[in-house]
């Protein structure tokens, strides 16, 4: 019987060009975490396997860093990174738990744009 729950950072926002940490935490179970997948609906970003370590998908290698912990750090964010991210915890003996994070990547603030184009 699956008793655990996944806690996530929920809905988060970050600025274009910045970075963000995607974090999930599995609680209320003594099940052993053997693998965590980080996915979007149509592609896999990274996997952390208890025996094999981290694997980052080649299409994300330049701007995804493993950790902290079982989390994932996305760097050099673009507006195309806006969307849903899933952490999929493979556990023994419980099975699979999934958490969902919605990331919104915002254009740099108006104040910053304003400052950049001010005439001295």
């Amino acid at each position: 019987m699956m008793t655990g729950t996944i806690e996530t950072t929920g809905n988060i926002s970050a600025e274009k060009g910045g970075s963000i940490i995607l974090q999930c935490h599995l609680s209320s179970t003594t099940a052993q975490v053997t693998q965590v997948n980080w996915e979007q609906q149509d592609q896999l970003l990274a996997i952390c396997n208890a025996d094999l370590g981290w694997h980052i998908s080649p299409s994300f290698k330049d701007r995804v860093a493993p950790g902290p912990g079982l989390g994932l750090t996305l760097q050099s964010l673009t507006v195309n990174d806006t969307g849903e991210y899933f952490c999929i915890y493979h556990t023994y003996p419980d099975g699979t738990y999934t958490g969902r994070i919605f990331l919104e990547v915002l254009e740099s603030s108006v104040a910053e744009h304003g400052a950049r184009f001010q005439i001295p």
């Epitope: 997948n37 592609q43 896999l44 396997n49 094999l52 694997h55 998908s57 899933f86």
Partner: antibody, heavy 118, light 107 residues
Amino acid sequence: QVQLQESGPGLVKPSQTLSLTCTVSGYSITSDYAWNWIRQPPGKGLEWIGYISYSGNTRYNPSLKSRVTISRDTSKNQFSLKFSSVTAADTAVYYCSRKYYGSWFPYWGQGTLVTVSS
Amino acid sequence: DIQMTQSPSSLSTSVGDRVTITCKASQDVFTAVAWYQQKPGKAPKLLIYSASYRYTGVPSRFSGSGSGTDFTFTISSLQPEDFATYYCQQHYSTPWTFGQGTRLEIK
């Protein structure tokens, strides 16, 4: 328990458009997951066609993209496949399926055979 | 696209046999491989995902292993109801692709 059921004509003429519908019961297609079409020519392997997600986003197999449209009717809890300019090579059993977030396929319809012939 | 090559394409076996099917990916897919069973006239049934995790309700005689490009699916002791065709699938990147299948026949 979620159930999927394909429906549509079993015979389509070459160069015409194949249209299939998948009716989902036991789960709302707007609640979660991505809803897929997969096909299997007689005696051959499986080919993923594409999906429509619960939010309405679509993704297609690049090799088929120019001929495929997946849409949905949320009031009927259905999603549909339109496949244009069909040839005999498109003769297959067409399955609708719900994928898990990790992109494996736990739930399938029973499949419907579509034959392309004049 | 990632090609998934299964071997053998067919296998003559008997009840009680240990059966091993292999699947080779054309590029590294880490552990992103699933296995399905399909009987004639029926839809595929998910058995294994993420290379080695049994789906809910799947008997323990079915197992999977491997990482990178080489994957193995094993039935430890073949039962009469296991005569079917088995497919691997990579769930690493779109378009998701399947092997050509391995048919288990009664010897």
